[in-house]
């Protein structure tokens, strides 16, 4: 069994300063855990590179919105 | 942590409306997808209606599509959900919920909920 209590928390510490294309992102997960500084959106690109954004900013709830509707479209 | 409280619900004849609201206590409201789940006596969770964060987008089961009507004031941290011609059907506990995580309607990708709210219909 996984030891939760121990599990390891991921946290970010500054946000990017640009704005990233929707085209280069594949997905997103929100940090809200108290151990952490800041409440942040990490987006996982198409290479999977990750980048810490601030889920504030307008184009980061707007590209968390554009990859939630993508979730809808069947895959063919 | 986000706190979600609903309020509205009631008794209400067929044919009648009521307006759910939710309220949010997240300092970052305008950044969580928001969706309302309801659930009857004996019966799982179902989902009835989501809205994006932006509340450009919004999408319905096709039970309460055209009748139900989601909105948001992100300035207020409150989401809605504007019931209309409700049927004896209806009857549930409705949940609003913070959806954190990719997905849309799905539950599983709805991380915060409130405590519900009690819509009875009576025929």
């Known amino acids: 069994q996984p030891d939760a209590i121990n599990a390891p928390v991921t946290c970010c510490y500054n946000f990017t300063n640009r704005k990233i294309s929707v085209q280069r992102l594949a997905s997103y997960r929100r940090i809200t855990s108290s151990k952490c500084p800041k409440e942040a959106v990490i987006f996982k690109t198409i290479v999977a590179k990750e980048i810490c954004a601030d889920p504030k900013q307008k184009w980061v709830q707007d590209s968390m919105d554009h990859l939630d509707k993508q979730t809808q479209t069947p895959k063919t | 942590e986000v706190q979600l409280v609903e309020s509205g619900g009631g008794l209400v004849q067929a044919g009648g409306s009521l307006r759910l609201s939710c309220a949010a206590s997240a300092r970052t409201f305008s950044s969580y997808r928001m969706g309302w789940f309801r659930q009857a006596p004996e019966k799982e969770r179902e989902f009835v209606a989501v809205i994006s964060r932006s509340g450009g987008d919004t999408f319905y089961s096709n039970s309460v599509k055209g009748r139900f009507t989601i909105s948001r004031d992100n300035a207020k941290n409150t989401v809605y959900l504007q019931m209309n011609s409700l049927k004896p059907e209806d009857t549930a506990v409705y949940y609003c919920?913070?959806?954190?995580?990719?997905?849309?309607?799905?539950?599983?990708?709805?991380?915060?909920w409130g405590q519900g709210t009690q819509v009875t219909v009576s025929s």
């Open positions: 919920a913070a959806g954190a995580q990719i997905g849309w309607a799905e539950a599983s990708t709805y991380d915060y």
